[in-house]
């Protein structure tokens, strides 16, 4: 009996530009002889329904139809026909099919590959055109994919050390698509320093499918006319 097993759950998620290994394990009742078996990997795009051959392994020959695509002959010996794709790109997401032939038997499995890109986040202070005691803080998130993203603002005071979500005076702009297919977005928080306590910590909180934990960038209100420290102005909080 010949059986193929793909990633549990049927979906694999990988970061953009990563060297991804798309899993495909072979279960066969006898020891595998790689010189008398065949492996073919196919890819079907999310945008069009045509299946394309990515990689082929037959006996003493292998051929990559996508640059760098490889199945390890050394891993194949122990039943692992996983496909390595170096430098995975957003447009390579879709359905991958692993087809195994041990004549006269054939088995196959499919998996959905999702490619994600994590946002980089930074805080900026914009005082241009603002009234006295008023400041606008901008939280820029860039280079993320997919488009869905959640940006919130929180504050912590000495009186209330637990974060409180801010809903007023927050404007989040539209997402902008970059040339490489990733997205950018900016969220703005307007503050009136005369109404806020010095020592209050403000946080921009970014939640995205690519992140295990939210991305947090913060600044502290000082007694003097508040502004970001130099590091806060220039640092990338990724």
């Amino acid at each position: 009996d010949l059986k193929v097993e793909m990633m549990a759950g049927g979906t694999q998620i990988t970061p953009l530009n990563d060297n991804v290994t798309i899993f495909c394990n072979i279960f066969y009742s006898q020891p595998l002889n790689i010189t008398s078996m065949g492996i073919t990997w196919f890819w079907k795009s999310l945008t069009f329904d045509k299946e394309v051959k990515v990689f082929e392994f037959f006996g003493d020959h292998q051929e990559a139809f996508r640059p760098g695509a490889i199945v390890s002959p050394w891993r194949l010996k122990s039943g692992d026909a996983s496909l390595r794709l170096p430098g995975i790109q957003l447009e390579e997401a879709g359905e991958y099919r692993c087809e195994v032939v041990v004549t006269p038997l054939k088995a196959q499995g499919t998996v959905q590959l999702e490619v994600v890109a994590s946002p980089a986040s930074r805080l900026l202070l914009d005082q241009v055109g603002m009234k006295e005691n008023e400041d606008k803080y901008m939280c820029e998130s860039s280079g993320f994919y997919p488009e869905a993203i959640n940006i919130t603002w929180e504050k912590q005071t000495q009186k209330f050390p637990h974060p409180i979500e801010i809903s007023e005076d927050v404007i989040t702009g539209p997402t902008i698509k970059n040339m490489d297919g990733t997205f950018n977005v900016t969220s703005c928080l307007k503050l009136n320093s005369s109404q806020e306590d010095p020592g209050t910590v403000y946080q921009c909180v970014v939640r995205h499918a690519s992140l295990h934990t939210p991305l947090r960038s913060n600044f502290t209100l000082t007694a003097a006319r508040h502004s970001l420290s130099e590091t806060e102005k220039t640092d990338n909080f990724s």
Epitope: N19, T21, F23, N25, D60, H61, Q62, I70, S72, P73, W74, R75, K77, S78, G79, D80, S82, R84
Partner: antibody
Framework: EVQLVQSGAEVKKPGASVKVSCKAS????????MDWVRQAPGKGLEWIGD????????LYNQKFRGRVTLTVDKSISTAYMELSRLRSDDTAVYYC?????????????WGQGTTVTVSS | DIVLTQTPLSLSVTPGQPASISCKAS??????????MNWYLQKPGQPPQLLIY???TLHSGVPDRFSGSGSGTDFTLKISRVEAEDVGVYYC?????????FGQGTKLEIK
């Protein structure tokens, strides 16, 4: 920085078993196989086998088949080599080595070695 | 099993002079256009370290005075100018077939 840290020296009696561990760090554990190689005192290198941490698949040198068991614990990025029914000629330094398997096959990083002495 | 025979088994070289080690395989170690021959150096009291893989590719961090060549059954490791730190035992290894096998080793000493 890639590191392979092996367990300490062992002294065993003939007929006993020994289990050597190899803790990996500094790379994605499942992206490389783990080779095991031994070296008897004053002798050359001898390949024992390898394990694929991705699926637990193993390849053994026929010479050791039935006596050696290679395993991994992915959760702690650790590989193990257990050798049973020990004989005096199993006295050697045992090495684990990270093995590239996609673009060629070679051991690019090695553990410091574990000395196993079999003596009655 | 593929048997690898190294020559010479030992050599003594003056610093700055070249050195060459041969490794002959009992059958071809080529597969699909590549040669699966690797070279390692084991310095005294240390584990082996990779020098060259796929017959001629220098491993990262290895000085370019080391070079490898050959295909099929005949392979050579060359050191263009031997340095004191090059002492140790050099092993060739084939990874085309299991069991992966090593040559018996060549001991390099400094004169």
């Amino acid at each position: 920085e890639v590191q392979l840290v092996q367990s300490g020296a062992e002294v065993k009696k003939p007929g006993a078993s020994v289990k050597v561990s190899c803790k990996a760090s500094g790379y994605t554990f499942t992206d490389y196989n783990m080779d095991w190689v031994r070296q008897a005192p004053g002798k050359g290198l001898e390949w024992i086998g390898d394990i694929n941490p991705n699926n637990g698949g193993t390849l053994y040198n026929q010479k050791f088949r039935g006596r050696v068991t290679l395993t991994v614990d992915k959760s702690i990025s650790t590989a193990y080599m257990e050798l049973s029914r020990l004989r005096s000629d199993d006295t050697a330094v045992y090495y684990c080595a990270r093995s590239e398997v996609f673009y060629g096959n070679y051991a690019d990083y090695w553990g410091q070695g574990t000395t196993v002495t079999v003596s009655s | 099993d593929i048997v690898l025979t190294q020559t010479p088994l030992s050599l003594s070289v003056t610093p700055g002079q070249p050195a060459s080690i041969s490794c002959k395989a009992s059958q071809s170690v080529d597969y699909d256009g590549d040669s699966y021959m690797n070279w390692y150096l084991q310095k005294p009291g240390q584990p082996p370290q990779l020098l060259i893989y796929a017959a001629s590719t220098l491993h990262s961090g290895v000085p370019d005075r080391f070079s490898g060549s050959g295909s099929g059954t005949d392979f050579t490791l060359k050191i263009s100018r031997v340095e004191a730190e090059d002492v140790g035992v050099y092993y060739c290894q084939q990874s085309k077939e299991d069991p992966r096998t090593f040559g018996q080793g060549t001991k390099l000493e400094i004169k």
